[in-house]
Amino acid sequence: MAVTACQGLGFVVSLIGIAGIIAATCMDQWSTQDLYNNPVTAVFNYQGLWRSCVRESSGFTECRGYFTLLGLPAMLQAVRALMIVGIVLGAIGLLVSIFALKCIRIGSMEDSAKANMTLTSGIMFIVSGLCAIAGVSVFANMLVTNFWMSTANMYTGMGGMVQTVQTRYTFGAALFVGWVAGGLTLIGGVMMCIACRGLAPEETNYKAVSYHASGHSVAYKPGGFKASTGFGSNTKNKKIYDGGARTEDEVQSYPSKHDYV
């Protein structure tokens, strides 16, 4: 029950996170005009990954897309790439995790397969979240650098009567959305990985019991199951049965997760 809850919660948290990453990527407010020196401005500038916008006091908003690819800063291109990779990985992770959910039954899918899918989606969510956090952090670093550069420029060359005020940009809402969304996706991914451990069939050193109809004696076959450590060739938690000779009327017991010996 706890495993199902952890997996379900991980899925929901990741879903919210990825929706947030998509929203942040599409948002225009990655950087907004710094209003420290002029808290009330008649023309307000803000920029996103794909276009820059100007909102006038009149209410008129004009947005212009970055129609060039080669002319854009390499850092901006890197941020775009990180966010897109994050979205793609997250989307694939969501798709995989839907099929991995314990509450959804698809054919005769084994718990081991669901465990693997849960782990895969969890890793994808973790990488997706890290991509988003990295992308937003790179952009934030770029803003901080430019902010202090423009602050330095602002106080140079003001000897004349005419002032040329340089527009400075600060953190926009999209950065905070991105950080939170990336964090949620990361948390969701960790939860999926935790759920995966609970989904994987537990390894006990079960004893295979051989029943003989004719005889009164019961023959025990010690070491009938080889305990798997999770490493080596037995990574998929498959039971390895010994190839001992059995009579036709021998009853085989396949212990499942809920069998108690």
Epitope: T41, V43, S57, G59, V165
Partner: antibody, heavy 118, light 113 residues
Framework: QVQLVQSGAEVKKPGASVKVSCKAS????????INWVRQATGQGLEWIGE????????YYSEKFRGRVTLTADTSISTAYMELSSLRSEDTAVYYC???????????WDQGTTVTVSS | DIVMTQSPSSLAVSLGEMATINCKSS????????????LTWYQQKPGQPPKLLIY???TRESGVPDRFSGSGSGTDFTLTISSLQAEDVAVYYC?????????FGQGTKLERK
């Protein structure tokens, strides 16, 4: 067509208050910002302030802050400008104007003459 | 506050001749975000409210004759009337529409010579 119609001329005593109205028609009142500008006889134009009818946000010129109050009644598409503590130098023609893209005032009313005299 | 300075304060031009009015701002009116200059030109005839002529320094308002043109960037702007007509006799104002408070130039009185 777009029209801005103001209230009639006012004669006030120093220290009194005046409230000028500006009724808009021919467009969606809440979609445009209303600006107030005054012009003393033979003088230039002087910006008083602006109001965003949708949210009621106001911005005032520092010169008039504390003395002027801009309001809007969206139900009757009317903007108001109230100027208190009137003095003789407040004698002027008061205009309301609609703000459009480029922060330009495209439609102006005919103006309300406010005379402050003892 | 941004100070707007117009020159000349009055100008007499013959009909059919070109008229040029200058406007200088104490601060740049060029917005880096959209590369537009937030300068507006108005025409005011006696006993009438001002009329919008040009916004964004060079964009002519609809219905304004094409003899009116605006130019300039940053801090220096010009309103040009290519061929003066009798109905163009008026006072012309430039306005900072970039920052609060919106400020107007003192006006240029255009007369017929």
């Amino acid at each position: 067509q777009v029209q801005l119609v103001q209230s009639g001329a006012e004669v006030k005593k120093p220290g009194a208050s005046v409230k000028v109205s500006c009724k808009a028609s021919g467009y969606t009142f809440t979609s445009y910002v209303i600006n107030w500008v005054r012009q003393a006889t033979g003088q230039g134009l002087e910006w008083i302030g602006e109001i965003h009818p949708r949210g009621g946000n106001t911005y005032y010129s520092e010169k008039f802050r504390g003395r002027v109050t801009l309001t809007a009644d969206t139900s009757i598409s009317t903007a108001y400008m109230e100027l208190s503590s009137l003095r003789s130098e407040d004698t002027a023609v008061y205009y309301c104007a609609r703000l459009r893209r480029g922060n330009a005032m495209d439609y102006w009313d005919q103006g309300t003459t406010v005379t402050v005299s003892s | 506050d941004i100070v707007m300075t117009q020159s000349p304060s009055s100008l007499a031009v013959s009909l059919g001749e070109m008229a040029t009015i200058n406007c200088k701002s104490s601060q740049s009116l060029l917005n880096s975000g959209n590369q537009r200059n937030y300068l507006t030109w108005y025409q005011q005839k006696p006993g009438q409210p001002p009329k919008l002529l040009i916004y964004w320094a060079s964009t002519r308002e609809s219905g304004v004759p094409d003899r009116f043109s605006g130019s300039g960037s940053g801090t220096d702007f010009t309103l040009t009337i290519s061929s003066l007509q009798a109905e163009d006799v008026a006072v012309y104002y430039c306005q900072n529409s970039y920052n609060y408070p919106y400020t107007f130039g003192q006006g240029t009185k255009l007369e017929r010579k």
